[in-house]
């Protein structure tokens, strides 16, 4: 089975369908997929040279 028309851009397409809690909607494949959690580390103390980079937790299987 092929996905929807290629010309249907993600932002022009219907709103993402609700996904179960361990999933999120992937605009690329236009379906719910397994998703991990994004996390933003606590800010560094005052005077630190640069903000901590945003990172991620691995997707749940």
């Amino acid at each position: 089975m092929r996905r929807g028309p290629r010309s249907l851009r993600g932002r022009d397409a219907p709103a993402p369908t609700p996904c179960v809690p361990a999933e999120c909607f992937d605009l690329l494949v236009r379906h719910c997929v397994a998703c991990g959690l994004l996390r933003t580390p606590r800010p560094k103390p005052a005077g630190a040279s640069s903000p901590a980079p945003r990172t991620a937790l691995q997707p749940q299987e």
């Epitope: 996905r3 290629r6 999120c24 992937d26 397994a34 998703c35 994004l38 691995q58 997707p59």
Partner: antibody, heavy 125, light 107 residues
Framework: EVQLVESGGGLVQPGGSLRLSCAAS????????IHWVRQAPGKGLEWVAW????????DYADSVKGRFTISADTSKNTAYLQMNSLRAEDTAVYYC??????????????????WGQGTLVTVSS | DIQMTQSPSSLSASVGDRVTITCRAS??????VAWYQQKPGKAPKLLIF???FLYSGVPSRFSGSGSGTDFTLTISSLQPEDFATYYC?????????FGQGTKVEIK
């Protein structure tokens, strides 16, 4: 440990066929999309095709559409790329890769996090 | 299809330099950009996803920024192991497309 292992590459004559396999371990392919990306000698990366094994959705680069078919067998945790009507310009190292997703306001934020070692396909007479 | 145009195509730099690579999309793609590093004979490695999120295990000297059509990968202090080719890729819409690559060489 997540691992992707490609196989099936080799030397084939123009017009011939090959079937590449991408065996996954450490995760289930039904939970994400699997992609084939190729790299011709001395050139950049070119995306070829993807499959979403859970529902069978697929898409292809224009350069291979009608000649290549991507598929997956979730029972074997393996994705495949059937390549027919091969041309000299299909000569490349073929990689399979997993797309990882992270939940950002309900939408995937991600990239291809695990790649195989690559398998060389040479199309020549 | 969305085209991703990277610049420069190559650059020479020294250890400790700050290096910036840019990628421009032919259409607005929000923040759906990933950056990869590739060394000769090896598979690419994911560095940055969603334009600015550092992938697990990637050194914090790598950072990404941008949204819409213009994106940047920055290496704050180039290390010997960073000499490689870097690619951007969009995943806002299929087909996902790569930039042509930027080769970072030793000056």
């Amino acid at each position: 440990e997540v691992q992707l292992v490609e196989s099936g590459g080799g030397l084939v004559q123009p017009g011939g066929s090959l079937r590449l396999s991408c065996a996954a371990s450490g995760f289930t392919i039904s939970s994400s999309s699997i992609h084939w990306v190729r790299q011709a000698p001395g050139k950049g990366l070119e995306w070829v095709a993807w499959v979403l094994p859970s529902v069978g959705f697929t898409d292809y680069a224009d350069s291979v559409k009608g000649r290549f078919t991507i598929s997956a067998d979730t029972s074997k945790n393996t994705a495949y790329l059937q390549m027919n009507s091969l041309r000299a310009e299909d000569t490349a190292v073929y990689y399979c890769a997993r797309r990882v997703c992270y939940n950002r306001l309900g939408v995937c934020a991600g990239g291809m996090d695990y790649w195989g070692q690559g398998t060389l396909v040479t199309v020549s007479s | 299809d969305i085209q991703m145009t990277q610049s420069p195509s190559s650059l020479s730099a020294s250890v400790g330099d700050r290096v910036t690579i840019t990628c421009r999309a032919s259409e607005e793609i929000a923040t759906a950009v990933a950056w990869y590093q590739q060394k000769p004979g090896k598979a690419p490695k994911l560095l940055i996803f969603a334009a600015s999120f550092l992938y697990s295990g990637v050194p914090s000297r790598f950072s990404g920024s941008g949204s819409g059509t213009d994106f940047t990968l920055t290496i704050s202090s180039l290390q010997p192991e960073d000499f490689a080719t870097y690619y951007c890729q969009q995943s806002e819409v299929s087909p996902p497309t790569f930039g042509q690559g930027t080769k970072v060489e030793i000056k």
